[in-house]
């Protein structure tokens, strides 16, 4: 129809100008469209320069929409991480404060002379929780060994106890069980509780990290062309009122976000494992019960040592020989009264239950984040047509969209009619993030069984790759032991984004 050839470009001028582009580019009326490289080559209101500007703009708008969606998810994960971290740190800090307040009165010099050893233990526990590559069982064993040496010397000031005698004492210690059942109980419970707490918080950190890194993956040129066609070609072709057909939009975005959808399986596995590990937060070996009650095990241990002092001394002398008596030394230390114990089971505060139920709900809500992303962006950002009728924009004209909707993920885009996707070239950043999810899931599964995956001889994640940028200070490289200097693989992730809490000045 010759009349339609000279249609005015007023509506396009308005839209183009509103986007901040110069109106001098816009023709007054439609022109022939042989110059168009993305949009169908009918009569058009777009010059080559306009087409290029709108293509760049549509690309940027999709990246912004993608980042916005990711930011919401990241913010949720960061809030969860902060809440749980605050709670776990609070439990440990509370325990240490209780120890500092009650032990001087309960144990006198047996505590004050060893305050540094107790402070160090809490620092080590804090570091372990925050992702330092230290062996918790070894750290606890070393604490008890050092404490035994010091307390034995204090309880026997009348004896000369040179280093070689103390070395012998250390070798006898395991058989003598000087602190009763407390060290074993604390080791079993603390290992399970701290492993569960730290792996859960690490899981939140890794999930957040993955979302952040994936949001930075650039969209390829084929995607840019398809999005331009989806969003702005209708304007160029003189049907600015036509909204994209829903299935057309889904195919474009499934093609654009094919690699992202491949995160789905491992993302679900990670979130499932995180929900599962929260079961370990309850009961007598649960996080709240154990982390908040470290001081009660320590009190029990010192009481046991005092109660067993005479038997212990006899056995040590039997194994290590008679130590020399210091002629000017005082008599043996008076037996102190037993330190009063707080009840071992902390009554649950309700805070953790609330945190866990919120976390479970939110983690379930975002389980299908990656595969629902195309649909979400289409419905929230693309001003879709309300129905798949013949009045929507199908990429060529106003009309019905006939192709079927593609499946999710890279492999399913082989016949995507809207985006040319090379299914043989997966995005490497996203593959690395899939590996990070796998490693973290493996860590959570081990933690569920009470094992610290970083200190198992045969780590089955098979990979040391990954960003590793979650490490604080030099936590990930450090080993703590004066008896051994192991060289196990450092953590791939410590806890990202947590505040420094060690290395504080004290006087």
């Amino acid at each position: 129809d010759p009349a339609s050839k000279s249609r005015s470009c007023g509506e396009v001028r308005q839209i183009y100008g509103a986007k901040g582009f110069s109106l001098s580019d816009v023709p007054q009326a439609e022109i022939s469209g042989e110059h168009l490289r993305i949009c169908p080559q009918g009569y058009t209101c777009c010059t080559s320069e306009m087409e290029e500007n709108l293509a760049n703009r549509s690309h940027a708008e999709l990246e912004t929409a993608l980042r916005d969606s990711s930011r919401v998810l990241q913010a949720m994960l960061a809030t969860q991480l902060r809440s749980f971290d605050d709670h776990f740190q609070h439990l440990l800090n509370d325990s240490e404060r209780t120890l500092q307040a009650t032990f001087p009165g309960a144990f006198g010099e047996l505590y004050t002379q060893n305050a540094r050893a107790f402070r160090d233990l809490y620092s080590e526990l804090r570091l372990y929780y925050r992702g330092a590559n230290l062996h918790l069982e070894e750290t606890l064993a070393e604490f008890w060994a050092r404490l035994l040496e010091r307390l034995f010397k204090q309880l026997h000031p009348q004896l000369l106890l040179p280093d070689d005698y103390l070395d012998c004492l250390g070798k006898q210690a395991e058989a003598l069980r000087p602190f009763g059942e407390a060290p074993r109980e604390l080791r079993l419970r603390a290992t399970r509780a701290f492993v569960a707490a730290r792996s859960f918080v690490q899981g939140l950190g890794v999930a957040s990290d993955v979302v952040r890194k994936v949001a930075q993956v650039p969209l390829g040129p084929e995607c840019s062309r398809a999005v331009m066609k989806l969003v702005y070609c209708a304007h160029c072709l003189g049907v600015p009122g036509a909204r994209p057909c829903p299935d057309y939009c889904r195919n474009v975005l499934k093609g654009c976000l094919a690699n992202q959808a491949d995160l789905d399986a491992e993302w679900r596995n990670l979130l499932d494992s995180m929900v599962l590990i929260t079961d370990k937060f309850w009961g007598t070996s649960g996080v709240e019960s154990v982390i908040g009650s470290v001081h009660t095990w320590l009190a029990e241990a010192i009481n046991a040592l005092q109660d067993n002092r005479d038997t212990l001394t006899a056995k040590v002398i039997q194994g290590c020989g008679n130590p020399k008596v210091n002629p000017q030394g005082p008599g043996p230390e008076e037996k102190r009264r037993r330190g009063k114990l707080a009840p071992r089971e902390r009554p649950p505060s309700g805070t953790l239950e609330k945190l866990v139920s919120e976390a479970k709900a939110q983690l379930r809500d975002v389980q299908d984040f990656w595969i629902s992303l195309p649909g979400t962006l289409c419905s929230e950002k693309m001003a879709l047509s309300t129905a798949s009728d013949d009045r929507c924009w199908n990429g060529m004209a106003r009309g019905r969209y006939l192709p079927e909707v593609m499946g999710d993920g890279l492999a399913n885009q082989i016949n995507n009619p809207e985006v040319e996707v090379d299914i043989t070239k997966p995005d490497m950043t996203i593959r690395q993030q899939i590996m990070q999810l796998k490693i973290m899931t493996n860590r959570l599964r081990s933690a569920y069984n009470g094992n610290d995956v970083d200190f198992q001889d045969a780590s089955d994640d098979g990979s040391g790759s990954g960003s590793g940028d979650g490490c604080l200070d030099d936590l990930c490289s450090r080993k703590v032991s004066r008896k051994s200097s192991s060289s196990r693989t450092p953590l791939t992730h410590a806890l990202p984004g947590l505040s420094e809490q060690e290395g504080q000045k004290t006087s």
Epitope: A117, E124, D163
Partner: antibody, heavy 119, light 107 residues
């Protein structure tokens, strides 16, 4: 065998800062506290503070608390002592010293670092 | 802080002499007292820890005794290598403190 090797002598102006290093070898670095002790010319020994190389926790002598910072780098088994707002009376030999076992007894000493503060 | 007082501040003695150095503390430190030897231009060396334990490798002519607030370092037969300054130090509490030193000179 245990060795503590300190950085070389320094000459500083009043008001400046100095950072002395102490590289440890021959034992598990994170297993023992490290202390800093100084000795002014012709004077006695003065304890400045300690650091736990495992955790980075520090305890300072109140006298130096506002001016001293002790840090460690576990990757190089090195501890550092930084003293700021130097004055002429800070001219001294600064020693790092490692504990014998967990006991506050200084069994191993660095060779010392002479810091001279002069305008 | 615990104040450490050594006496004498210096002494002159001959090879073969028996030498005793005293260290007193401003409060009880039980047996947490250590002795160091320092030669000019060198770092101190640990001799005795926990009041009376001889560090491995230190000659047996050195001995230590005492408890509470009063301690003694004894060199049973002074040797040429023993002319140096000796310091006591408490490891009972923080801040760690040293005595002012006792210089042992050749008579």
């Amino acid at each position: 065998q245990v060795q503590l090797v300190q950085s070389g002598a320094e000459v500083k102006k009043p008001g400046a800062s100095v950072k002395v290093s102490c590289k440890a070898s021959g034992y598990t670095f994170t297993g023992y506290y490290m202390h800093w002790v100084r000795q002014a010319p012709g004077q006695g020994l003065e304890w400045m503070g300690e650091i736990n190389p495992s955790t980075g926790d520090t305890t300072y002598n109140q006298k130096f608390k506002a001016r001293v910072t002790m840090t460690r780098d576990t990757s190089t088994s090195t501890v550092y002592m930084e003293l700021s707002s130097l004055r002429s009376e800070d001219t001294a030999v600064y020693y790092c010293a490692r504990e014998k076992r967990d006991d506050g007894v200084f069994a191993y000493w660095g060779q010392g670092t002479l810091v001279t503060v002069s305008s | 802080e615990i104040v450490m007082t050594q006496s004498p501040s210096s002494l002159s003695a001959s090879v073969g002499d028996r030498v005793t150095i005293s260290c007193r503390t401003s409060q009880t430190i039980r047996h947490y007292l250590n002795w160091y030897q320092q030669k000019p231009g060198k770092a101190p060396k640990l001799l005795i820890y926990d009041a009376s334990n001889l560090k491995t490798g230190v000659p047996s002519r050195f001995s230590g005794s005492g408890s509470g607030t009063s301690f003694t370092l004894t060199i049973s037969s002074l040797q040429p290598d023993d002319f140096a300054t000796y310091y006591c130090q408490q490891s009972y509490s923080t801040p760690r403190t040293f005595g002012q030193g006792t210089k042992v000179e050749i008579k």
